[in-house]
Amino acid sequence: QSPTPSPTGLTTAKMPSVPLSSDPLPTHTTAFSPASTFERENDFSETTTSLSPDNTSTQVSPDSLDNASAFNTTGVSSVQTPHLPTHADSQTPSAGTDTQTFSGSAANAKLNPTPGSNAISDVPGERSTASTFPTDPVSPLTTTLSLAHHSSAALPARTSNTTITANTSDAYLNASETTTLSPSGSAVISTTTIATTPSKPTCDEKYANITVDYLYNKETKLFTAKLNVNENVECGNNTCTNNEVHNLTECKNASVSISHNSCTAPDKTLILDVPPGVEKFQLHDCTQVEKADTTICLKWKNIETFTCDTQNITYRFQCGNMIFDNKEIKLENLEPEHEYKCDSEILYNNHKFTNASKIIKTDFGSPGEPQIIFCRSEAAHQGVITWNPPQRSFHNFTLCYIKETEKDCLNLDKNLIKYDLQNLKPYTKYVLSLHAYIIAKVQRNGSAAMCHFTTKSAPPSQVWNMTVSMTSDNSMHVKCRPPRDRNGPHERYHLEVEAGNTLVRNESHKNCDFRVKDLQYSTDYTFKAYFHNGDYPGEPFILHHSTSYNSK
C-alpha cells in the first residue's frame, strides 16, 4: 500500500515527487526543484508539510485524479496519498489534460467491457503493480470512504442511518465532524462538540495505517525511517527520536513498537522493510547515437548488488504528460535540438526511496535540403550550380556529380552558395546531388537536392587504328576505329583523298569503312580520315599510300 494520510491531514513524502496529473499543485505538496542537465538524485532533505487540522478536507471528488484526500475514519481505511504531485514543471500539460500510464502487459488484468460502461475494469488485485498514480481515481468504496462533490456520498442506499466520525484534532475525538449517511445515500456533514472524552482506541488501531518515508544518508549508507504521524510517538527500546528511526541497514527488516498516551495497548508493531541503498541505482541515458536527434531512452541501472527482493521494486517515469511504469523508456518523434525533462522515481514496496530528473537535449537533426537555384553547363568542360542553404544547422556541403557510372564527390565549405565544376567531359549528362551535413553524435546527412545538365559539344578525338589496303591495282580499302570521345550528338566518318594538293575524293559514311575505286595507277595518295559529331570535326588521321603499275 502507498502512504496513507495521518489522522489530522495529508502528509507529503519528503522527496520531491514526479508530477503525474493535471491540476495545479496543492498547497501541501513538495514539487521538484529544477533538475540538473545531467542527473539529480535527491538527498531527502526537504521538510514535511502537512495540512493543519482546520484544513482537513471535507469533500472528495471521485473524478479528481490527484487530490485524493478523504476522512481518516474508524473502520474504513484511508485514501492513499499519491506520491506524485502535479504541474511541477513547465512541460506538464495545461489544465484539462491528463497523464496516462504506459506499462507493459499486465498478465492478470482484463479488458472486459461491462454493459453501459466504457472503462476498463480495475478490480482490486488485478493490477500488475500497486499503483500510486494520481491517474487512478479515488480508491473504490470497498476500501475507502470517498465523498463526492456537493457532499453526495457515492455509497449504496442503507436501511438505517450510519454515523462515521472523522478526526480533526490531535486530542482524539475531543472535537469532531460527523458525517451522517441517510438511507438515500446523501451525506450531511455537521460539526458538534462532544463534552465527554470517550474511551481511547488501541495504538494498534490508531496507527494501523501509519506510513513511512525513508531518508538515505550517502555518507553512512544508512536509512532513517520517518514515521508520518502528527504527535510525538514513543517506540519500544527507545528506537526512535522525533518520530524517526535511525541507522537502518538496506534490505533488512526492523521491528518498531509504537505507542502514545492517546491510545492504549496493544502497541502498534510496525515492520520496516528497508529499501536498497540509493547509490545502487543510476539513471542512464540509453539513447542510440544514430537516433539521438529525435529519440530519448532512459533506463535505471542496478550498478551494485543488493539483497532486497527486486520483485518489490517498481520504477516510474514521467515525461511531459506521458507516464510509464517501466525500468526503461523510449520516446520517439521528438524535435531535434530541444531540451526534454523526464522525472523518475523508484519505489520499494510502494514506498518511494529515490528519484531523479534528467534534462536531455536531443542531438542536432539532419539539416534540411538545400534549394538549388540553377544548374547548367556553361561550356564543354564546365558547369555551374548555385543554391540557397538549408534553414537548420549544418557544418558543410557535399556535392556529388555522376556521369554514367562514375561518381565524384567534393566537400564544400558551409558558406558557399555557388560552385563551378571544371574538367568535365563534353556532351555528357551529369547528375548532381547536393546535401548539407552536420557532425553531431554521428554525421547526419540532410536530404539531397538533385539536378542535371549536359555539357556542350567539343571536337571529337581522333579516329584510330586506321588502315589503308590495296584491293586491286586502282582500288583501296580504308578502315578505322571510332574515336574514344565523340563529344557530340551525331556520328559520321569522313574520308578525304588527296593527290598532291588536289582533293580527289571526299566521302562520308556511317561507319569507318571506305572502298575507294578508280584511282590513278602509280600515284601517291594522302588518305585523311576523321570523325564528325554533328557540331565539330575531329583531328584527321593521315596515311600515305601509292597505287601500283597496272598489272595488265
Partner: nanobody
Framework: EVQLEESGGGLVQPGGSLRLSCAAS????????MSWVRQAPGKGPERVAV???????????SYADSVRGRFTISRDNARSTLHLQMNSLKPEDTAVYYC?????????????WGQGTQVTVSS
C-alpha cells in the same frame, strides 16, 4: 460522454499491413494522451503504442518492444482521430485492438476505451 470507436481491423496475411483508426468525441482530443492497447485471447492487455506531449513535441510517441519499428501511432487533431499503422504483421499480433484515452473521470489502468476492432494475422 467520452466515445471512442475503432475501425480498420480485419484478416491479413503475415507480412501484410493494416491501418486502424479511432474516432474520438466527448472530450478535448488534442490535449489527451492516447494509446492503442491490445488483448490477445487468454492474455492480459498490452499497451503497444502511446502518443502524448513532451515539451514542445506534441506528437511524442512510445512503443512496446514487440512492435517498435513495425507500428506507427499518429493523430489527426483536426478530425479527432487516432491512427495505428501496422506493417510487417506477425501471427502474434492477432488480438482485439482498443483505442484508449485517459480522460478526467475515467477509471482503470488505461482509462476510457472503445469497443475494439479484431485484427487476425493468419495465412
Amino acid at each position: 460522454e467520452v466515445q471512442l470507436e475503432e475501425s480498420g481491423g480485419g484478416l491479413v496475411q503475415p507480412g501484410g499491413s493494416l491501418r486502424l483508426s479511432c474516432a474520438a468525441s466527448g472530450f478535448t482530443f488534442s490535449n489527451q494522451v492516447m494509446s492503442w492497447v491490445r488483448q490477445a485471447p487468454g492474455k492480459g492487455p498490452e499497451r503497444v503504442a502511446v502518443i502524448g506531449s513532451v515539451g514542445g513535441a506534441t506528437g511524442a510517441t512510445s512503443y512496446a518492444d514487440s512492435v517498435r519499428g513495425r507500428f506507427t501511432i499518429s493523430r489527426d487533431n483536426a478530425r479527432s482521430t487516432l491512427h495505428l499503422q501496422m506493417n510487417s504483421l506477425k501471427p502474434e499480433d492477432t488480438a482485439v485492438y482498443y483505442c484508449a484515452a485517459r480522460v478526467r473521470g475515467s477509471t482503470g489502468d488505461f482509462g476510457s476505451w472503445g469497443q475494439g476492432t479484431q485484427v487476425t494475422v493468419s495465412s
